[in-house]
């Protein structure tokens, strides 16, 4: 058993049929010695008396808010949460496996630039009685500071018969140099509590590996005389690291109709303009990627050909 | 500790081309190592990230773009002095700081070159003959060093009398390639910045 935060404790349980469970001793936070009774949650049933209460925690019915009282007055609370371990593996029931980039990916993180700011998000089908707490650091043995905000519900989607909820959090490395060469990864730890179930999820990455630039901005078209060709130009996104001659991007320019199956024109360039063939009812799209370290491509920025 | 704005004219910067070749060569070699050594811990997640140039050179700090010198987090640098007579310095206006940057890059390349050559000698003794260093990568390191053209004492190639542990050597190769790729990215960024300034 360990303390998650003040008056909240996590009991780690091997979860299998007829498991013996864990013996837990609760101590009432009071100078009083006599006349103390214990109850669980809203029940008025007295579970025991005395300054300490010893319980055998085997299942969720044994978890919850234990309260010690004296003469009708509440002295203190202890909330017990369960963390299940099945076949030596901690449960991952609360969050959905996003399966990208690989199986057992529960947390996904992205950074728009090298400033040390990044966003992580996760998915769940649970809508109520759910809380998250996020911590992060650079390295684990001698951790350097990363400050994370509160996790917030950022999107709701309908998937078949189910509703899916996306939560996200923004974090910022306390002293980040955009030009630095990372040797220690960022560690992100998410504590998830659903009702009386506790789970924790972690992700470890280098900022350079989670870079995904914003789409290029200010796309403009200029038809070329006596030609089917169009010159398309754009600018670096505002959120990209500067100077741009140091943090350079490369671009993919594509002309395609509404359907992915339609024919297309495609060209890659390090410049902020390109010449392509425009077709009626097609769009010109441009996306960006770090020129020297191939992490993710940005989303497309698009303009219609006409 | 930072790059000046007054740097060579665009067409006069021979090192840009060589640094692009370097990044390409090390990336290809790393990809080859990951594929060939698929049953060894050779991915970014599996290896320890070590920098053989740590406390010996200060490339990131010495080559910091002017715009980042206002960022306090970028300025916790180690002071290092280098000889300054490189041929990539195509302009007399080139400052001492730029020379410091380029000589730091030269020292990095020299250190990695020695490590890679020592390692290749060991890998050539492996009865499995599983992986060797790409000669193209070694040639590209050499070309960039020649383009930088700094005078510096030659570092003797490390020779080891004991029987090499090939498993350890291959893991060290992965560590070295990962670190060198990251340094090659920095070098490419620096050359691009200098070329554009």
């Amino acid at each position: 058993i360990w303390e998650l935060k003040k008056d909240v404790y996590v009991v780690e349980l091997d979860w299998y049929p007829d498991a013996p469970g864990e013996m837990v001793v609760l101590t009432c936070d009071t100078p009083e010695e006599d006349g103390i009774t214990w109850t669980l949650d809203q029940s008025s049933e007295v579970l025991g008396s005395g300054k300490t209460l010893t319980i055998q925690v085997k299942e969720f019915g044994d978890a919850g808010q234990y309260t010690c009282h004296k003469g009708g007055e509440v002295l203190s609370h202890s909330l017990l949460l369960l963390h299940k371990k099945e076949d030596g593996i901690w449960s991952t029931d609360i969050l959905k496996d996003q399966k990208e980039p690989k199986n057992k990916t529960f947390l996904r993180c992205e950074a728009k630039n090298y400033s040390g700011r990044f966003t992580c998000w996760w998915l769940t089908t649970i809508s109520t009685d759910l809380t998250f707490s996020v911590k992060s650091s650079r390295g684990s043995s001698d951790p350097q500071g990363v400050t994370c905000g509160a996790a917030t519900l950022s999107a709701e989607r309908v998937r078949g018969d189910n509703k899916e909820y996306e939560y996200s959090v923004e974090c910022q490395e306390d002293s980040a140099c955009p030009a630095a060469e990372e040797s220690l990864p960022i560690e992100v730890m998410v504590d998830a509590v659903h009702k009386l179930k506790y789970e924790n999820y972690t992700s470890s990455f280098f900022i350079r590996d989670i870079i995904k630039p914003d789409p290029p901005k200010n796309l403009q078209l200029k038809p070329l005389k006596n030609s089917r060709q169009v010159e398309v130009s754009w600018e670096y996104p505002d959120t990209w690291s500067t100077p741009h001659s140091y943090f350079s991007l490369t671009f993919c320019v594509q002309v395609q109709g509404k359907s992915k199956r339609e024919k297309k024109d495609r060209v890659f360039t390090d410049k902020t303009s390109a010449t392509v063939i425009c077709r009626k009812n097609a769009s010109i799209s441009v996306r960006a990627q770090d020129r020297y370290y191939s992490s993710s491509w940005s989303e497309w920025a698009s303009v219609p050909c006409s | 500790r930072n790059l000046p704005v007054a740097t060579p004219d665009p067409g006069m910067f021979p090192c840009l081309h060589h640094s692009q070749n370097l990044l390409r060569a090390v990336s290809n070699m790393l990809q080859k190592a990951r594929q060939t050594l698929e049953f060894y811990p050779c991915t970014s997640e599996e290896i320890d990230h070590e920098d053989i140039t740590k406390d010996k050179t200060s490339t990131v700090e010495a080559c910091l773009p002017l715009e980042l010198t206002k960022n306090e987090s970028c300025l916790n640098s180690r002071e290092t002095s280098f000889i300054t007579n490189g041929s990539c310095l195509a302009s007399r206006k080139t400052s001492f700081m730029m020379a410091l940057c380029l000589s730091s890059i030269y020292e990095d390349l020299k250190m990695y070159q020695v490590e890679f050559k020592t390692m290749n000698a060991k890998l050539l003794m492996d009865p499995k003959r599983q992986i060797f260093l790409d000669q193209n990568m070694l040639a590209v390191i050499d070309e960039l060093m020649q383009a930088l053209n700094f005078n510096s004492e030659t570092v003797p190639q490390k020779s080891s009398l004991e029987e090499p542990d090939f498993y350890k050597t291959k893991i060290k190769l992965c560590i070295l390639l990962h670190a060198f790729r990251i340094r090659a990215v920095t070098i490419d960024r620096v050359m691009s910045y200098l070329n554009a300034s």
Epitope: R228, Q229, T250, R261, E262, K263, K264, D265, R266, V267, F268, T269, D270, T275, I277, R279, K280 | -
Partner: antibody, heavy 118, light 107 residues
Framework: QVQLVQSGAEVKKPGASVKVSCKAS????????LHWVRQAPGRGLEWMGW????????EYAPKFQGRVTMTTDTSTSTAYMELRSLRSDDTAVYYC???????????WGQGTMVTVSS | EIVMTQSPATLSVSPGERATLSCRAS??????LHWYQQKPGQAPRLLIY???QSISGIPARFSGSGSGTEFTLTISSLQSEDFAVYYC?????????FGGGTKVEIK
Amino acid sequence: QVQLVQSGAEVKKPGASVKVSCKASGYTFTDYYLHWVRQAPGRGLEWMGWIDPENGDTEYAPKFQGRVTMTTDTSTSTAYMELRSLRSDDTAVYYCAANKELRYFDVWGQGTMVTVSS
Amino acid sequence: EIVMTQSPATLSVSPGERATLSCRASQSISINLHWYQQKPGQAPRLLIYFASQSISGIPARFSGSGSGTEFTLTISSLQSEDFAVYYCQQSNSFPLTFGGGTKVEIK
């Protein structure tokens, strides 16, 4: 499967014209760009131009501008390349090639040998 | 127009050996570079597109790399059916242009 079948070999006199055909099958004809590439005996490949069968748009290499015409007949899924004012150095194998992507060639015809000789 | 130069013109390699073919562009073409194989009496066949992207059905021994002005096609272990002429082609700008080809012959 996607296939391009070209017309047979031709022998032409200098100054004449030649029209080579390329019949497509195994895909919707208007879904692919169509290019013409030639190869002189013992020489490399030379791109001549492209046509979009969907709308008849064309782009020709400057070298052939004014001397080449590329057309398509969507009813028969056939593309045509006509080269005028033939010279002896136009002797080559002429290939049609197609792709959903404009700038490279995924599927090739078997080639048509055009000999220009007096 | 962009001029593509391939080297060497002829490459003599023993079966099972590695072959490295080079292609250089007269100006930077990013990764707009494609590789083809042509056997005598046959049409060319696309091997690699956009410098390094592999094509389904093409053996994994064929790989491409490079960007900017310098590109490489590598055949990791030559098989008898790989002896042919190889062409690179740029798609950075029109007119599309090919290299002069590299003939890979049996040593």
